[in-house]
Interface confidence: low
C-alpha cells in the first residue's frame, strides 16, 4: 500500500506540513454494510490502528512522492460471523513530533469510505482511493482466525487431538481432514459450504445462496438494485468455496488464490507450502523472487530478506505495484511485466517512458538556419531563404517564385532576395506605384495593412528600393521557450497557428504603418503577451529585419 499525491492534483508538500518530523497512522474501521454510512455510527464490526510507523522528516522544498508506509498488516479483528458486505473506512492521521511542532499534534489528513463485498478466505482485493490531493493505494482481505472456517467464519474447527481420530464430540472438518469441527447443530441438510447457524435447527445462508438449506444459488440479477442484503436474505453472488476456504495457511500465513490452487504468504520465521515449517534459517532459502537472505545462521536467530526491486514482504513474496507510481508519462499505459515495466504510449509519444513528444520541435533539427515550426499536431521546418525540403537541406532559388511585382528584377542576396523595380515602382516587392509627379507613393493595398491617411505612406522619392520585413503587417515573432528548471533552454522556435499578438514596439521603418489587429484602430499595448502552455514560460520578441537601401540606376 502507498499514500501519496494523486496525479494531476498539484504537488502537495510532504505530509509533515513543514513543521518538523511526523508520523502517519492509519485507522481502519469496519461497519455493517446494511447500515447507512454515517460519520457518527460505530465501527460495529471492528477497528484497528496501524503500528510500527516510520518517522518522516521534512525536507524543505521537496515534494512528496508515494510515501513509504508502515510494514506489515493492519489487522482488524471482527466480531461474530463475517457478513460479506461491509463498509470500509480508512483514515490517515498525522502525528506531529518534536518540541516546536506548534498547533495540534494530531491531524486527519484523509478519510476514504467505501462499501465492499468480500468473502472470507478470498484473495487480496486491491483498491485506489483519492481524497483531496492525496491518493491511497491499499489491499484488503478477510480471513478466519482458527478455529473458525468457511466464507462467513461461522464454522468451528478444532485442532486434531489425536493422530488418527477427532477428540470426543468432534468430527472431521470437511475441507481439511487434518482438522476437526464441532458437530453440526444446524437444521439437517443445511449446506455446510453455503449455510451456517448460530442457533440449533437454524440454516442461515451466506451471500449468493438461498433456499431453506442454502443450496440454491441466487441469480446475479438481484445485484442490479442497490439493496445491500443481510446474511440471511437473498443477495449478490459471491465467489463460491475456493481453495483458500478455511485458510490452509498455518501460523498466521495469509492465503491467496492462484489459478485454482492457493499460495501462502508466510510471516517471518515460517516457511513451506502452508507456512507449517518453523525454525527457518537462510540455508532453507526462505526468500522468494531472488531476495537476499541475511542472518538466520541458526534456527534461533531471525533471518531478514532483502528484496529485489519489485518485491516486498518478509519473504519477498509480495509483488510491488510499480505501476501505481505512474512511471509512464503523457498518459501512457503502464504494464508491469514482472521482469520489467513497459509503457504503451499514446499516439504522438514515444520512448521507454513515453517521454518523447513526437509532435514537438525538441528533437527536430532544421538545417541551414531553418526554424522548426509546430502547429496542428505536427511539425515542419520553415527554411531560410535559399533552402528548402523537409529539413532545409536542399538548395532553393529564392527568385524561383518570381516574387518581384510589376516587372521588377529579382536578385539573390546573402540575406534573401532583392527586387530591382521597374521605373515607376518601388517597395520590397515593387508593389508601390510611384506617382508621376513624385508627390505620393500609393501602395497597391498590401494585405494586412488598413487603408489609412495616404500621407502615412509618404516615402522619400530618392529611395528606389526599400527592404523591410513586416511591411505586409507580419513582424517576425521569435518565441523563446524555457521549460521549468534551471538553464534548460530548448532554443528558439516559431509557433504557427497562434494568433499574432498586437505589437507595441515596431521597427523604425514601420512606425508609420498600422498593423491590422481585429477591429482595433492601431497597435494596442500588449508587450506582456505571455500565455504559458504546458508549463513553458515564453518570452516574445519582435525582431526587425535589416533595411536595405539601393540607388536607382
Amino acid at each position: 500500500h502507498s499514500f501519496g499525491p494523486g496525479p494531476g492534483l498539484g504537488t502537495p508538500r510532504s505530509p509533515c506540513n513543514a513543521r518538523g518530523p511526523c508520523r502517519l497512522f492509519f485507522r481502519v474501521c469496519l461497519k455493517p454494510g446494511v447500515s447507512q454510512e454515517a460519520t457518527e455510527s460505530l465501527c460495529a464490526l471492528g477497528a484497528a490502528l496501524s503500528t510500527s510507523v516510520p518517522v518522516y522528516t521534512e525536507h524543505p522544498g521537496e515534494s512528496a512522492a508515494a510515501l513509504p508506509l508502515p510494514d506489515g498488516l493492519v489487522r482488524v479483528p471482527f466480531r461474530d460471523a463475517w457478513p460479506g458486505t461491509f463498509s470500509l473506512v480508512i483514515e490517515t492521521w498525522r502525528e506531529q513530533l518534536g518540541e516546536h511542532a506548534g498547533g495540534p499534534a494530531w491531524n486527519l489528513l484523509a478519510r476514504v469510505v467505501g462499501r465492499r463485498r468480500l468473502a472470507a478466505g478470498g484473495p487480496w482485493a486491491r483498491d485506489v482511493q483519492r481524497t483531496g490531493t492525496w491518493e491511497l493505494h491499499f489491499s484488503y482481505r478477510a480471513r478466519c482466525e482458527p478455529p473458525a472456517v468457511g466464507a462467513a467464519c461461522a464454522r468451528l474447527c478444532r485442532s486434531r487431538s489425536a493422530p488418527s481420530r477427532c477428540g470426543p464430540g468432534l468430527r472431521p472438518c470437511t475441507p481439511f481432514p487434518d482438522e476437526c469441527e464441532a458437530p453440526s447443530v444446524c437444521r439437517p441438510g443445511c449446506s455446510p459450504e453455503h449455510g451456517y447457524c448460530e442457533e440449533p435447527d437454524e440454516c442461515r445462508c451466506l451471500e449468493g445462496w438461498t433456499g431453506p438449506l442454502c443450496t440454491v444459488p441466487v441469480s446475479t440479477s438481484s445485484c442490479l438494485n442497490s439493496r445491500v442484503p443481510g446474511p440471511a436474505s437473498t443477495g449478490c453472488l459471491l465467489p463460491g468455496p475456493g481453495p483458500c476456504d478455511g485458510n490452509p495457511c498455518a501460523n498466521g500465513g495469509s492465503c491467496s488464490e492462484t489459478s485454482g490452487s492457493f499460495e501462502c504468504a508466510c510471516p517471518r520465521g515460517f516457511y513451506g507450502l502452508r507456512c507449517e515449517v518453523s525454525g527457518v534459517t537462510c540455508a532453507d532459502g526462505p526468500c522468494f523472487n531472488g531476495g537476499l537472505c541475511v542472518g538466520g545462521e541458526d534456527p534461533d536467530s531471525a533471518y531478514v530478506c532483502h528484496c529485489p526491486p519489485g518485491f516486498q514482504g518478509s519473504n519477498c513474496e509480495k509483488r510491488v505495484d510499480r505501476c501505481s507510481l505512474q512511471p509512464c508519462q503523457n498518459g501512457g499505459l503502464c504494464l508491469d511485466l514482472g521482469h520489467a515495466l513497459r509503457c504503451r504510449c499514446r499516439a504522438g509519444f514515444a520512448g521507454p517512458r513515453c517521454e518523447h513528444d513526437l509532435d514537438d520541435c525538441a528533437g527536430r533539427a532544421c538545417a541551414n538556419g531553418g526554424t522548426c515550426v509546430e502547429g496542428g499536431g505536427s511539425r515542419r521546418c520553415s527554411c531560410a531563404l535559399g533552402f528548402g525540403g523537409r529539413d532545409c537541406r536542399e538548395r532553393a532559388d529564392p527568385c524561383a517564385s518570381r516574387p518581384c511585382a510589376h516587372g521588377g528584377r529579382c536578385y539573390a542576396h546573402f540575406s534573401g532576395l532583392v527586387c530591382a523595380c521597374a521605373p515607376g515602382y518601388m517597395g520590397v516587392r515593387c508593389e508601390f506605384a510611384v506617382r508621376p509627379d513624385g508627390a505620393d507613393a500609393v501602395p497597391a493595398a498590401p494585405r494586412g495593412l488598413r487603408q489609412a491617411d495616404p500621407q502615412r505612406f509618404l516615402l522619400p522619392p530618392a529611395l528606389g528600393l526599400l527592404v523591410a520585413a513586416g511591411l505586409a503587417g507580419a513582424a517576425l515573432l521569435v518565441i523563446h521557450v524555457r521549460r521549468r528548471g534551471p538553464g534548460q533552454d530548448t532554443g528558439t522556435r516559431l509557433l504557427s497557428g497562434t494568433r499574432e499578438p498586437s505589437v507595441h514596439t515596431l521597427p523604425d521603418a514601420l512606425n508609420n504603418l498600422r498593423l491590422q489587429d481585429g477591429a482595433g484602430d492601431g497597435p494596442s499595448s500588449s508587450a506582456d503577451w505571455n500565455h504559458p502552455e504546458d508549463g513553458d514560460s515564453r518570452s516574445i520578441y519582435v525582431i526587425p529585419a535589416p533595411s536595405i537601401y539601393a540607388r536607382e540606376a
Partner: antibody, heavy 118, light 107 residues
Framework: QVQLVQSGAEVKKPGASVKVSCKAS????????MNWVRQAPGQRLEWMGW????????TYADDFKGRVTITRDTSASTAYMELSSLRSEDTAVYYC???????????WGQGTTVTVSS | DIQMTQSPSSLSASVGDRVTITCKAS??????VAWYQQKPGKVPKLLIY???NRYSGVPSRFSGSGSGTDFTLTISSLQPEDVATYFC?????????FGGGTKVEIK
C-alpha cells in the same frame, strides 16, 4: 514450460467474423501482456494489438481499429482475438505472442490459419 | 507510424560465412529493437532483444548491435540450421512495426 496453444484453422466468408483463442500455460497469465500478430502469405509480420491481461485493457493498431477486439478470460488463462468484416486480404496466419519482460514477444503460439474465401 | 526497412530482402551465403542483416528505422527508436528467426512453416523465435541482448538459448554466433535508427543482426559463422527468414521489430512506439524480412539461404 511456457506454452501458448491456439485454436484450429478457420475458413470464413467475406463479411463474416472470426474469433481465435490462445490458451496460456506454464506461467502466471496475468503477469504478462499478450500480443496478436498476423502474417499474410509471403508478407511481413503485422502487429494487430495487445491486451494487458491483468487489467483487460486492449490497445489496437490503427489499421485494425473498429474491426478487431482483443479480450481475455483470466480464469481460463486464455486470450481471444476477434476480427470482423472479413475480406480476402485478411487471409493469413494469426499468432498470439506473450509480451516478455524485456522483449515484445518471447513466446509465440503455433498460429491459426484463417482463410477468407467466397 | 515508424517504418522499419530491412536489407537485403534475401541473401545466399556459404556455411561458415559471416552474414550481416541491417534494419533502418524511419526515426529514432532508442534500442527498442528485437530480432526474430522464422524457419519455413514454423513460428517466429526471439533471437535478440533491446538491440544487442541475446535471448536465452540462442547460440552465441548470433549478435545484435545498433541504436537510434540503424541496427544490425550478425551471424558470425553461418550454419545450415540458420536457413530462415529474419525479421526486426521496433517496440519503441505503438504501433509496433516489423521489417520486411531477410531470407537467408545456403549457397
Amino acid at each position: 514450460q511456457v506454452q501458448l496453444v491456439q485454436s484450429g484453422a478457420e475458413v470464413k466468408k467475406p463479411g463474416a467474423s472470426v474469433k481465435v483463442s490462445c490458451k496460456a500455460s506454464g506461467y502466471t497469465f496475468t503477469n504478462y501482456g499478450m500480443n496478436w500478430v498476423r502474417q499474410a502469405p509471403g508478407q511481413r509480420l503485422e502487429w494487430m494489438g495487445w491486451i494487458n491481461t491483468y487489467t483487460g485493457d486492449p490497445t489496437y493498431a490503427d489499421d485494425f481499429k473498429g474491426r478487431v477486439t482483443i479480450t481475455r478470460d483470466t480464469s481460463a488463462s486464455t486470450a481471444y482475438m476477434e476480427l470482423s468484416s472479413l475480406r480476402s486480404e485478411d487471409t493469413a496466419v494469426y499468432y498470439c505472442a506473450r509480451i516478455g519482460g524485456n522483449s515484445p514477444s518471447d513466446y509465440w503460439g503455433q498460429g491459426t490459419t484463417v482463410t477468407v474465401s467466397s | 507510424d515508424i517504418q522499419m526497412t530491412q536489407s537485403p530482402s534475401s541473401l545466399s551465403a556459404s556455411v561458415g560465412d559471416r552474414v550481416t542483416i541491417t534494419c533502418k528505422a524511419s526515426q529514432s527508436v532508442s534500442n527498442d529493437v528485437a530480432w526474430y528467426q522464422q524457419k519455413p512453416g514454423k513460428v517466429p523465435k526471439l533471437l535478440i532483444y533491446y538491440a544487442s541482448n541475446r535471448y536465452s538459448g540462442v547460440p552465441s554466433r548470433f549478435s545484435g548491435s545498433g541504436s537510434g535508427t540503424d541496427f544490425t543482426l550478425t551471424i558470425s559463422s553461418l550454419q545450415p540450421e540458420d536457413v530462415a527468414t529474419y525479421f526486426c521489430q521496433q517496440d519503441y512506439s505503438s504501433p509496433w512495426t516489423f521489417g520486411g524480412g531477410t531470407k537467408v539461404e545456403i549457397k
